[in-house]
Interface confidence: low
């Protein structure tokens, strides 16, 4: 019906034709040089074909192409067409780079823009079998050719193709690299439940490795582990102890599996523990020691159970590196069973056991409190000889308002005198002993300090010019002594301090200044401590005038003189009365005077004359004397 030539290249043609839908048995195609120089080519093709590539023609040559179909022995009319092949453009050189075991890179040179595309054919040299045909765009000058066989010689042919023709082929021969393979398979760090597998490879980018682990006797199914292609070692845990294994590995790279490498290895024996021993037993502790396979255990579990099952079970987890343990905080005189097991990542060993009995605690007893007084008391106790390193005495007030006081004493002491406590409050005393670092249960006692002894009712009486009498009250049998402190209120003289034995409750104080105000303080002393003081104010009496003398005596007058007391007075009163009886007479003079004239006396009479000093309402004792007036005459 219609015959066309498309894609006429420099050495071939592509034919397309149309035909009705008769069941053609075949088509016959004839190709002949237009000048009939060469014999025509006759081709037979299947009847369902409607296109055909015709290669192997001459460059720049005119051709006549004819076709007819055959159906049920009938030949259709011939269809013909004329066409020419093109001239060959120049290809440059073709080279091969980056030759691998399954690929290479093809490079070539060619004029820019000359070719619509390039046609590349890859043949195996030994079989001359075409393994790849590919067409690439005309702008390319390089192409990767993957999917090749390792260690194989190839012929690679390159043609440039334009709109009308293809170039003469350029060829190159190349040998691919050998296959990648693993090497140096070894097993390191073999433990009882695992191992580390190491291998070496050529320097290629493996996708992954497949590791196969199987018991040598094939009892269990093999484990297949896939590991990343970047690794050259892998841990394989979860194996059985003391078991032979075959470990195999292959690499996968671009869909290719390397040959498998294998090695045989046996896991180590299962880890063990043993020789559990008890040592260094004390009332509250003991030490444990044991043996164990090194480098295996993460942890040991120690369980401590008292034989009577009265105490809560104690469990201790300790590092797998340890081979000893110190067990403390136990009660004395108690039987224990000790269980030990070792724990590794996927195993707990069978439990081993031993027994231990804590020692009895030395005795500490009979806590006694004696010599209680307002400021303290004595604590005493009994204890086993040479059993204790030290004692701890703790004293705390019953109200728990104050910080506890703690006293650490040597193990030889059995008594502690406590001083400096607060009077009249309750105290709790705890005594415990220390032996080999362990503390006994404390003994406990309570007591109350006595009330503070008091002095009271300080009274002043019988004031004299140089003193006065003091009296006071105090609790009986408490005080060792009393102290009286006296000082004039104006602080013109040094204070006096008088110490008295305890039975006394009065004291005459002398040697003071007359008419002087004194402050008095009295306190008791008990066991070296002072009671609260009591105070009073007292004033000494005025001093009396002294050394009365008479002079210038006449029948009806006389002069009386005296020495004034030390302290200033307001006045002096002079009283004179006949010895034989009669009304007394009085004269008052200024306190600065020390003499006065007595007048209107009776001649030849004996008079008693008294002088007193006065200040306010206070009067001094008198100074007295007698005089006899002269007779008339």
């Amino acid at each position: 019906e219609n015959l066309t030539v498309t894609e006429a290249g420099w050495d071939g043609l592509r034919l397309n034709w149309t035909a009705d839908d008769l069941a053609y048995e075949y088509f016959v195609i004839q190709v002949q040089e237009a000048n009939n120089v060469e014999t025509a080519h006759n081709f037979t093709v299947p009847g369902n074909l409607r296109a055909a590539d015709i290669p192997g023609l001459k460059v720049a040559t005119s051709y006549r192409v004819s076709i007819y179909g055959v159906a049920r022995g009938y030949r259709t009319p011939v269809l013909s067409a004329e066409t020419s092949t093109g001239t060959t453009p120049n290809l440059g050189e073709v080279t091969v780079a980056e030759v691998g075991w399954d690929a290479l890179t093809l490079n070539w040179t060619a004029p820019e823009g000359a070719y619509k595309n390039f046609f590349i054919q890859v043949l195996e040299a030994d079989t001359t079998q075409t393994v790849q045909n590919l067409t690439v765009p005309g702008g390319l000058r390089s192409v990767d050719l993957p999917g090749l066989k390792a260690a194989t010689r190839y012929y690679i042919t390159l043609r440039g193709v334009t709109q009308d023709f293809g170039t003469a082929p350029l060829s190159v021969e190349v040998l691919t690299e050998d296959l990648p393979q693993l090497g140096g398979l070894s097993v390191t760090e073999v433990s009882w439940d695992g191992l580390t597998l190491n291998w070496t490879t050529d320097d290629l980018a493996y996708k992954h490795f497949v590791v196969q682990v199987q018991e040598a006797n094939n009892v269990e199914a093999a484990q297949n582990l896939t590991v990343p292609g970047s690794l050259r070692a892998v841990d394989i845990p979860g194996l059985k102890a003391d078991t032979p294994y075959r470990v195999s590995i292959y690499g996968v790279i671009q869909g290719y599996r390397t040959p498998m490498l294998s090695t045989d290895v046996s896991t180590a024996r299962e880890p063990e523990i043993g020789n559990l021993n008890v040592s260094d037993v004390t009332p509250k502790s003991f030490n444990l020691s044991w043996t164990a396979t090194d480098g295996i255990f993460d942890m040991f579990t120690i369980e401590i159970i008292d034989s009577n099952r009265l105490l809560q079970t104690a469990e201790h987890n300790i590092s797998g590196a340890e081979r000893t343990a110190h067990i403390s905080g136990l009660p004395p005189s108690t039987d224990f069973i000790v269980y030990l097991s070792g724990i590794a990542p996927s195993i707990r060993t069978k439990t081993i056991s031993t027994t231990a009995t804590t020692e009895a605690l030395p005795l500490l007893e009979n806590l006694t409190i004696s010599d209680t007084n307002p400021y303290g008391f004595t604590v005493s106790w009994t204890a086993s000889e040479n059993a204790f390193d030290s004692f701890l005495v703790t004293v705390v007030d019953s109200g728990k308002l104050l910080d506890p006081q703690e006293f650490t004493l040597s193990g030889t002491q059995r008594k502690l005198e406590l001083r400096g406590l607060i009077t009249g409050i309750g105290y709790e005393v705890l005594v415990s002993g220390f032996t080999q670092g362990h503390q006994t249960k404390p003994l406990r006692a309570e007591t109350i300090t006595e009330a503070e002894p008091e002095v009271d009712n300080l009274l002043v009486s019988d004031a004299t010019p140089d003193g006065f009498r003091l009296s006071w009250t105090a609790d009986e049998g408490i005080f060792d002594s009393f102290v009286i402190r006296i000082r004039d209120t104006k602080k013109q003289s040094e204070p006096q301090e008088i110490s008295l034995p305890s039975p006394e409750r009065t004291r005459d104080i002398t040697g003071l200044r007359e008419a002087t105000e004194y402050e008095i303080e009295l306190y008791g002393i008990s066991r070296g401590r002072r009671s609260q003081p009591v105070s009073a104010i007292a004033t000494t009496a005025m001093g009396s005038p002294k050394e009365i003398m008479f002079s210038d005596i006449t029948e009806n007058a006389a002069t009386v003189s005296w020495r004034a007391p030390t302290a200033q007075v307001e006045s002096f009163r002079i009283t004179y009365v006949p010895m034989t009886g009669g009304a007394p007479s009085m004269v008052t003079v200024d306190g600065t005077d020390t003499e006065t004239r007595l007048v209107k006396l009776t001649p030849g009479v004996e008079y008693r004359v008294s002088v007193i000093a006065m200040k306010g309402f206070e009067e001094s004792d008198p100074v007295s004397g007698t005089l006899i007036t002269a007779l008339d005459g």
């Epitope: 590991v227 990343p228 690794l231 841990d235 394989i236 979860g238 993460d298 942890m299 996927s346």
Partner: nanobody
Framework: QVQLQESGGGLVQAGGSLRLSCVAS???????????LGWFRQAPGKEREFVGA????????YNPDSSKGRFTISRDNAKNTVYLQMNMLKAEDTAVYYC???????????WGQGTQVTVSS
């Protein structure tokens, strides 16, 4: 008993990365380094699939069908934590990711609650 808690999941664009963490606690006195740990995933309507694992001493293994060279597992014993680094994520990586104790597909006794990873295309 051991508790495992995963974190780090979430929504990520295709081609992106995520780092999942799994913290172990309550190891009953055992050190964390005593455990192998594995990562698994379960896509909707599919069976749980093994992604990879890390052994006690830090060796790692992977499922090539799920990881395709894009996933990396690591651990930090000091922090009791195992990690799953996922690069070049694809929509088919969408799943709930779980961590489990004892690795290498052998006896995974303890499992976390899982963390959802969603890869949008």
């Amino acid at each position: 008993q051991v508790q495992l808690q995963e974190s780090g999941g979430g929504l990520v664009q295709a081609g992106g990365s995520l780092r999942l963490s799994c913290v172990a606690s309550g190891t009953s006195g055992l050190t964390f380094r005593s455990f192998g740990l594995g990562w698994f995933r379960q896509a909707p309507g599919k069976e749980r699939e093994f992604v990879g694992a890390i052994s006690m001493t830090g060796g790692t293994i992977y499922n090539p069908d799920s990881s395709k060279g894009r996933f990396t597992i690591s651990r930090d014993n000091a922090k009791n934590t195992v990690y799953l680094q996922m690069n070049m994520l694809k929509a088919e990586d969408t799943a709930v990711y779980y961590c489990a104790v004892n690795g290498l597909g052998l006896n995974y006794d303890y499992w976390g609650q899982g963390t959802q990873v969603t890869v949008s295309s």
